[in-house]
């Protein structure tokens, strides 16, 4: 919908979770609402309770199974409805046909670690979490490094246009504290978006050796 005040947006993490946000100006704060998922070719259906995340926005996670189980495929369509209680009955507030692999947002990368650090460079690795085997190598990453005296928003983005779960940061300043974050995105999906940023990894470059050029 073009109207930004009222939206029902959901993303699939590629395995067993559909996360939804429902925003609605003027909606009643104390009304009980839920998201109901009905797949077109599966025997299960699932419901989650919408909980407030701001004054006019609610969110919930449809847990479809064990975290690493592949619950949906590229041919699945899931009808998602927002239902709110009105007295003794439930009223449909919003509806959409959700194509999971057109609306992907993966989990943030995990297990960030410093593989090797020197005075001017640092090699960092990470892992992707709960990502479908369907992607094979069709993933890309963005990374950013927080330098002293700067904000994350000012940090330049480094783009890795392939499934590469490591990076070598160069031209760093010796004996300096940095933080590093990475996020991931599948190449598939018309409405696919970047994962959240990973938890920041703090590291410090080695001090320059005394009496040597830096």
């Amino acid at each position: 919908a073009v109207n930004g005040t009222s939206q029902f947006t959901c993303f699939y993490n590629s395995r067993a979770n559909i996360s939804c946000v429902w925003s609605q100006d003027g909606a009643l704060q104390d009304t009980s609402c839920q998201v109901h998922a009905w797949p077109d070719r599966r025997r299960w259906n699932q419901t989650c309770e919408l909980l407030p995340v701001s004054q006019a926005s609610w969110a919930c996670n449809l847990i479809l199974g064990a975290p690493d189980s592949q619950k949906l495929t590229t041919v699945d369509i899931v009808t998602l409805r927002v239902l709110c209680r009105e007295g003794v009955r439930w009223r449909v507030m919003a509806i959409q046909d959700f194509k999971p692999f057109e609306n992907l947002r993966l989990m943030a990368p995990i297990s960030l670690q410093v593989v090797h650090v020197e005075t001017h460079r640092c090699n960092i690795s990470w892992e992707i979490s709960q990502a479908s085997h369907y992607f094979e190598r069709h993933l890309e990453f963005e990374a950013r490094t927080l330098s002293p005296g700067h904000t994350w928003e000012e940090a330049p983005l480094l783009t890795l246009k392939q499934k590469q779960e490591w990076i070598c940061l160069e031209t760093l300043t010796p004996d300096t504290q940095y933080e590093f974050q990475v996020r991931v995105k599948p190449l598939q999906g018309e409405f696919t978006t970047w994962s959240p940023w990973s938890q920041p990894l703090a590291f410090r470059t080695k001090p320059a050796a005394l009496g040597k050029d830096t």
């Epitope: 919908a1 029902f8 925003s23 009808t79 409405f191």
Partner: nanobody, 123 residues
Framework: EVQLVESGGGLVQVGDSLRLSCAAS????????MGWFRQAPGKEREFVAV????????VYADSVKGRFTISRDNAKNTVYLDMSSLKPDDTAVYYC????????????????WGKGTLVTVSS
């Protein structure tokens, strides 16, 4: 952009049936929610029914449940509203509308609208 053109309106008697059609065109039609709304003279526009394009899932206003049926023909890019047991209260201009991604959180809010077709139910 989605273009919508309604047809099928006219003058009918109480208890009669009528079929409205909405021809849709545009790049995003295949993933849209398609709805029918109506506006009676001197009243606000109200939601009648909506259908999802891919699975054909439907939602109806209480006032038309059991009397009106919304359907779609994907091959023809057309949405229909079959109206039966018509009452004088059903007299209104009927509008076809489309909701495209990101989807609306409110059945009354749509992105694209047709110009409408008049249905008059006389007693």
């Amino acid at each position: 952009e989605v273009q919508l053109v309604e047809s099928g309106g006219g003058l009918v008697q109480v208890g009669d049936s009528l079929r409205l059609s909405c021809a849709a065109s545009g790049r995003t039609v295949g993933s849209a929610n398609m709805g029918w709304f109506r506006q009676a003279p001197g009243k606000e526009r109200e939601f009648v029914a909506v259908i999802t394009w891919s699975t054909g899932s439907t939602v109806y206003a209480d006032s038309v449940k059991g009397r009106f049926t919304i359907s779609r023909d994907n091959a023809k890019n057309t949405v229909y509203l079959d109206m039966s047991s018509l009452k004088p209260d059903d007299t209104a201009v009927y509008y076809c509308a489309a909701d495209v991604y990101p989807y609306s959180g409110n059945l009354n809010i749509m992105d694209y609208w047709g110009k409408g077709t008049l249905v008059t139910v006389s007693s």
